[in-house]
Interface confidence: low
């Protein structure tokens, strides 16, 4: 004979647990129905009546099967440096992620609590490690023979052009200037751009970074004049 189907509320066998989407109500000492996502318990069960569920009100939600007396409040609206990647509905909280050019400096269970602008490497410094969703750009001084003349969160140090005759030698922040009109460098001129991080949970393919001398620490510091050795800007 098939096992008898028990309808909620029912008293569980000693030592057994309630079934999926049921909970044990300690007051009634019965297994009772949980409320579905998007609902909450309006009236708790008794020995003779099951849980009465009701829909969550506007701007509140429950994400799981539950028996909470009130739905949870959705988080506050996304700030100007964020984009709303998931709206507040009766079944899910609002999720805010950082907009392009920013990274998440303080995350929360889902989404981001505090976004900060990606560091920009100053002239003489290039990107050693690109920014991601959750980490800032790391800058490094351009090594001898390379330069960066931009303030950028994506540009890396590029090799100096090789001149037949050098008019002005290159340095960390300036390319060499040739007297000849035909430099021998085979690389195409112009800045090399790294891909901007996107605010989704995608895989980032990144070049292997060199050891960095510019740690990512300045996102909350007030922006005053800073020594050139730091190699980054806050704007």
């Amino acid at each position: 004979l098939p096992a008898q189907v028990a309808f909620t509320p029912y008293a569980p066998e000693p030592g057994s647990t309630c079934r999926l989407r049921e909970y044990y109500d300690q007051t009634a000492q019965m297994c009772c129905s949980k409320c579905s996502p998007g609902q909450h318990a309006k009236v708790f069960c008794t020995k003779t009546s099951d849980t009465v569920c009701d829909s969550c009100e506007d701007s509140t939600y429950t994400q799981l099967w539950n028996w909470v007396p009130e739905c949870l409040s959705c988080g506050s609206r996304c700030s100007s440096d964020q984009v709303e990647t998931q709206a507040c509905t009766r079944e899910q909280n609002r999720i805010c992620t950082c907009r392009p050019g920013w990274y998440c400096a303080l995350s929360k269970q889902e989404g981001c609590r505090l976004c900060a602008p990606l560091r920009k490497c100053r002239p003489g410094f290039g990107v050693a490690r690109p920014g991601t969703e959750t980490s800032d750009v790391v800058c490094k001084p351009c090594a001898p023979g390379t330069f960066s003349n931009t303030t950028s969160s994506t540009d890396i140090c590029r090799p100096h052009q090789i001149c037949n005759v050098v008019a002005i030698p290159g340095n960390a922040s300036m390319d060499a200037v040739c007297t000849s009109t035909s430099p021998t460098r085979s690389m195409a001129p112009g800045a090399v751009h790294l891909p901007q991080p996107v605010s989704t949970r995608s895989q980032h393919t990144q070049p292997t970074p060199e050891p960095s001398t510019a740690p990512s620490t300045s996102f909350l510091l007030p922006m005053g004049p800073s020594p050139p050795a730091e190699g980054s800007t806050g704007d």
Epitope: Y23, Y24, Q63
Partner: nanobody, 124 residues
């Protein structure tokens, strides 16, 4: 398989302390409220402490407020109950239980998984 295993119970003198542990397996603590309940001989089971899975907020029954502290270590998938200033009326079998994501009060209001319990005896 979902399991909760309590440990740390035993005999303690009045005024003494104990730390109960509840090791969870088969699920991650992050997404559930966890609670401690107790049942004294000849009495109904009562909820005494709950910790929420959503934000870690805690709730205690009046009878243990200021003496018992519930905590969790998600990395170890374990819930703890620190019990201080124990009195003979705290003698009971202590059960660990799982609720949904949220607590509402010390009793969880219900539970869907619970352990077999650990006996705490307070006596001189």
């Amino acid at each position: 398989q979902l399991r909760l295993v309590e440990s740390g119970g035993g005999l303690v003198q009045p005024g003494g302390s104990l730390r109960l542990s509840c090791a969870a397996s088969g699920f991650s603590l992050d997404y559930y409220s966890m609670g401690w309940l107790r049942q004294a001989p000849g009495k109904e089971r009562e909820g005494i402490s709950c910790i929420s899975g959503s934000d870690g907020s805690t709730y205690n029954a009046d009878s243990v407020e200021g003496r018992f502290t519930i905590s969790r270590d998600n990395a170890k998938n374990t819930v703890y109950l620190e019990m201080a200033s124990l009195q003979p009326e705290d003698t009971a079998v202590y059960y660990c239980a799982r609720g949904t994501l949220y607590c509402f009060g010390p009793s969880l209001g219900g539970m869907d998984v619970w352990g077999k319990g650990t006996l705490v005896t307070v006596s001189s």
